[in-house]
Structure formats: structure tokens, C-alpha cells
């Protein structure tokens, strides 16, 4: 949807982040083997081992 575009572009091309359309925010992608501690992680400390 058009209103998502400007926000989505801020994450574009950054493999460590993704754009969550539901919360309309750029989120940090937890590395494999780690799990998020919140719905839209913002930094590596928002990821932990299960």
C-alpha cells in the first residue's frame, strides 16, 4: 500500500533489518539461532537464545 513505501525504504537493502507492515516499523532481524524478545526488535540485545 502506498503509505507504507517511505517507511519501507528505510530498511531496503539492509539484510539485518526488515519492514513489518503490521507495525509499520523497521525491525532488527535476529540472527539464526536467536529469538526475538519483542515483536519488533530494534537491536541485537532484543534477541536471545531460546
Amino acid at each position: 500500500f502506498p503509505q507504507d513505501r517511505p517507511f519501507e525504504d528505510t530498511c531496503h537493502g539492509n539484510p539485518s533489518h526488515y519492514y513489518d507492515k503490521a507495525v509499520r516499523r523497521c525491525c532488527y532481524r535476529c540472527p539464526m539461532g536467536l529469538f526475538p524478545t519483542q515483536q519488533c526488535p530494534q537491536r541485537p540485545t532484543d534477541c536471545r537464545k531460546q
Epitope: 513489518d20 507492515k21 519483542q38 515483536q39 526488535p41
Partner: nanobody, 123 residues
Framework: QVKLVESGGGSVQAGGSLRLSCAAS????????MGWFRQAPGKEREWVAR????????YYADSVKGRFTISQDNAKNTVYLQMNSLRPEDTAMYDC????????????????WGQGTQVTVSS
Amino acid sequence: QVKLVESGGGSVQAGGSLRLSCAASGYIYSSNCMGWFRQAPGKEREWVARIHTGSGSTYYADSVKGRFTISQDNAKNTVYLQMNSLRPEDTAMYDCAAGRVVLGAVVCTNEYWGQGTQVTVSS
């Protein structure tokens, strides 16, 4: 990279049924979620339902509880949304999302999105 492809949308009369499919390809996290969102023109995107694919636990928005059922076919890496007793207010673009279960919570990240499938319910 995970790719999500939705299908099954269309036009239906009020009271009718549709079944949406969301096929996932690529790497899928072992502790993951797949869910459905919808957005009607001029309205906010709304969460509809999700399934925690490891445990099979399902969750629904109050607006669809008792009418919609989310299920999975692990062999096909596909999640389905069976929509019964459809109402005109269910008209929207339906998006599939995939992500990981948040530790200590029943919510999920929404890391991957499909392109959406349109559902139109007429009275």
C-alpha cells in the same frame, strides 16, 4: 530468503465461503509463525489469525472468531485460512506474513510478507 505466495481470493456473496492459501518456500525458522492480516481501503491493517507452526496453536481476532479457521499442511509448507459466513465487512486485501514466535509471548514477528489476495464480499 523466504517467499510467500497467496491464492484463493475472489468475490463471493455474503454468507459464502472462501479458502485462502499461503505457500512458503525457502528457509523456514523452526520456531515460527504464519498468519493473516487484512486491510480494507482507507482502513488500518488488521491482524486476522495466526498459527504457531511448531505447536499448532492457533489465535484469532475477535471479529473472525468462530467463522475463520487457520490450519497448516507441513508437507506442503502451506497455511490455509478457511473463511465461512463471510460478511461485507470482511472485504479487504488479505496478506500472509511469516516470522518467529516472540520469547515468552504469544505474538510473532512479521519478517516476511506475501503480495496479498483480494477478497470481496457483496451483500
